[in-house]
Interface confidence: low
């Protein structure tokens, strides 16, 4: 299967009911502390505000946050770690009316309440220490 370029950046238009699907695999073993980062940006710029920041510290924890007016807000942390060392995973981010729900391999693990309107999201960026095989947005 061919790999997508990483960082992977796509312009998007999201609304309630949208799903962002990502299939990937950590580039290195968990001992080397790989990361996955997914950012929902409000502009097509890397330094723009972020409605939803999802970062996996593989083998350790998951952090979620938003960045508003260039300032990071209150972090939401989870110790749930369904990701397996060296294993491909499917990540689905569901846009619900009140929150983002993140599913890993078909199971819901993380929730993040909306802080910035979903309609403001213009771009999704997937990056850091992964090989990326699929990125899809369905509305």
């Amino acid at each position: 299967m061919s790999l997508l370029s990483v960082p992977h950046t796509e312009s998007v238009s999201l609304s309630t009911g949208s799903t962002v699907t990502i299939e990937a695999r950590p580039l290195v073993c968990f001992f080397n502390e790989p990361h996955l980062q997914v950012d929902f940006h409000t502009e097509m710029k890397e330094d723009s505000d972020i409605a939803f920041h999802f970062q996996v510290y593989f083998g350790n924890r998951v952090v979620m946050n938003s960045r508003e007016y260039r300032t990071w807000k209150e972090e939401v942390e989870s110790k749930n770690m369904p990701f397996q060392d060296g294993q491909e995973f499917e990540l689905r981010i569901l846009v619900l009316e009140d929150k983002y729900q993140v599913m890993v391999n078909g199971q819901a693990y993380y929730n993040f309440n909306h802080r910035i309107p979903v309609s403001s999201v213009k771009m999704v960026q997937v990056w850091r220490d992964i090989s990326l095989t699929k990125f899809n947005v369905s509305n």
Epitope: S5, V6, P7, L27, E33, H35, W127, R128, S131
Partner: nanobody, 121 residues
Framework: ELQVVESGGGLVQAGGSLRLSCAAS????????MAWFRQAPGKEREFVAA???????TYADSVKGRFTISRDNAKNTVTLQMNSLKPEDTAAYHC???????????????WGQGTQVTVSS
């Protein structure tokens, strides 16, 4: 600790080519993601291209199709082949090494002094 030194810069006419090299010292070179950034006078440092430990790469839109990044883990080198150069490519080109693969400068821990590329029209 990793040390990186760039070479290969120079003066070239628009439409010409240059090949930049980045030599890294240290046996851990293969564990780092590598990138090239550039900085023109009075401007912010700008991402050019990056390559993962295993060879996956990405490019800034402004250089896609013209520049190619590659690495040789056996020789501890990263190269940036620059073709179809334009005057707006004029800048100091810096090689960087970091633990994560990114187009954000702050993600990179080790930086070279840079090599100057000047493209005349």
């Amino acid at each position: 600790e990793l040390q990186v030194v760039e070479s290969g810069g120079g003066l070239v006419q628009a439409g010409g080519s240059l090949r930049l090299s980045c030599a890294a010292s240290g046996r851990t070179f293969s564990t780092y993601s590598m990138a090239w950034f550039r900085q023109a006078p009075g401007k912010e440092r700008e991402f050019v291209a990056a390559i993962t430990r295993s060879g996956g790469n990405t490019y800034a839109d402004s250089v896609k199709g013209r520049f190619t990044i590659s690495r040789d883990n056996a020789k501890n080198t990263v190269t940036l082949q620059m073709n179809s150069l334009k005057p707006e490519d004029t800048a100091a080109y810096h090689c960087a090494a970091g633990g994560t693969y990114s187009f954000v400068p702050r993600s990179y821990n080790y930086w070279g002094q840079g090599t100057q590329v000047t493209v005349s029209s």
